[in-house]
């Protein structure tokens, strides 16, 4: 027996109550491929989303999400709240960044500061609880009589002492 | 026959997840969407959600987005449902619940024997 | 969403009389599911679509309504039809239920 539902194309659906007839979807569905047995719900966009495509009898609806919220996930599944610069969203609401961290977006977490440091390098700017410290050159480069063409220090194999 | 068979009863801690089955027999389970809906003791019938298993598709009561998931391996024509962060109003039974996509009237032809869910610490 | 209303919350009857209830969406719906449920039991299928009655439903069950005014009717009440009786929409997402009409035999 040949399957008509193949037939089907998207905006329908094959109905097994009729002959494998293909019958449109009703209001508020969808298929989005031919050969559906069914369709499906259309996603609906309330409370903290807001729609940015409309459902079609061929596609889903698209959500976004409110002002002072933003998307989280595939296709926007969540809507999580934004915070200000500076700031992280807990449990408790959006708190500051604690000392030695930042956040320059209004969604995520506090980061820590570039350790210049460790890149033997120094810090040029102060970090505050929006930005991230912004490194300069090491303090030897900025020595009186340092060349720019100073060779590169030997690297050690691991595991071995200065002698 | 078609039958819905749901996992044993289940009791868990507060914060604690579960996941529970339906196991479908007697007809082609990829031609139905699977429903899973909530009843407290003494109370009545909350509709979860939905996946429909041929394409994996789902549809949530925005009241449980954050609660259940829902996923389906039609290799062996089962549904499942993961409840996370349990609370004391997560105890209740739920059930799984076929409806037939063809009608497109949304109807729950046929259920599935419950599973309970009771939150304890 | 939806919210169905339904009447009486209990319903007590004699065998053979007839019986109605309610139930009524908040807006209006497209048509009307019917669920019974007895006490230990998962619901079962009772009435689609406002009028179409399940498979091994017996003929004195009967539905009927439109827009947000819904019923379900038995001519003649049998000591069996002890449940409650739950009605369902799906016209606007999400899928609801109304809270039941508890049928009592007396």
């Known amino acids: 027996l040949q399957d008509l539902c193949s037939n089907c194309p998207a905006g329908t659906f094959c109905d097994n109550n009729r002959s494998q007839i293909c019958s449109p979807c009703p209001p508020n569905s969808f298929s989005s491929a031919g050969g559906q047995r069914t369709c499906d719900i259309c996603r609906q966009c309330k409370g903290v989303f807001k729609t940015r495509k409309e459902c079609s009898s061929t596609s889903n609806a698209e959500c976004d999400c409110i002002s002072g919220y933003h998307c989280l996930g595939a296709e926007c599944s969540m809507c999580e709240q934004d915070c200000k610069q500076g700031q992280e969203l807990t449990k408790k609401g959006c708190k500051d960044c604690c000392f030695g961290t930042f956040n320059d977006q209004k969604r995520g977490i506090c980061r820590p500061w570039t350790n210049c440091s460790l890149d033997g390098k120094s810090v040029l700017v102060n970090g505050t609880k929006e930005r991230d410290v912004v490194c300069g050159p090491s303090p030897a480069d900025l020595s009186p009589g340092a060349s720019s063409a100073t060779p590169p220090a030997p690297a050690r194999e691991p595991g071995h002492s200065p002698q | 026959q078609v039958q819905l068979q749901q996992s044993g009863a289940e009791l868990a801690r507060p914060g604690a997840s579960v996941k529970m089955s339906c196991k479908a027999s007697?007809?082609?389970?990829?031609?139905?969407?699977m429903h899973w809906l909530k009843q407290r003791p003494g109370q009545g019938l909350e509709w979860i959600g939905y996946?429909?298993?041929?394409?994996?598709?789902?549809n949530y009561n925005q009241k449980f987005t954050d609660k259940a998931t829902l996923t389906a391996d039609k290799s062996s024509s089962t549904a499942y449902m993961q409840l996370s962060s349990l609370t004391s109003e997560d105890s209740a039974v739920y059930y799984c619940?076929?409806?037939?996509?063809?009608?497109?009237?949304?109807?729950?032809?046929?259920w599935g024997t419950g599973t309970t869910v009771t939150v304890s610490s | 969403q939806i919210v169905l209303s339904q009447s009486p919350t209990i319903l007590s009857a004699s065998p053979g009389e007839k019986v109605t209830m309610t139930c009524r969406a908040s807006s209006s719906v497209s048509y009307i599911h019917w669920y019974q449920q007895k006490p230990g039991s998962s619901p079962k299928a009772w009435i689609s679509?406002?009028?179409n009655l399940a498979s091994g439903v017996p003929a004195r069950f009967s539905g009927s309504g439109s827009g947000t005014s819904y019923s379900l009717t038995i001519s003649r009440v049998e000591a069996e039809d002890a449940a409650t009786y739950y009605c369902?929409?799906?016209?606007?997402?999400?899928?609801?239920f109304g809270s039941g009409t508890k049928l009592e035999i007396k």
């Open positions: 679509a406002t009028s």
């Open positions: 996946i429909n298993p041929s394409s994996g598709y789902t």
């Open positions: 007697g007809y082609t389970f990829t031609f139905y969407t």
């Open positions: 619940a076929r409806s037939d996509g063809s009608s497109s009237k949304w109807y729950f032809d046929v």
């Open positions: 369902q929409q799906w016209s606007s997402n999400p899928f609801t």
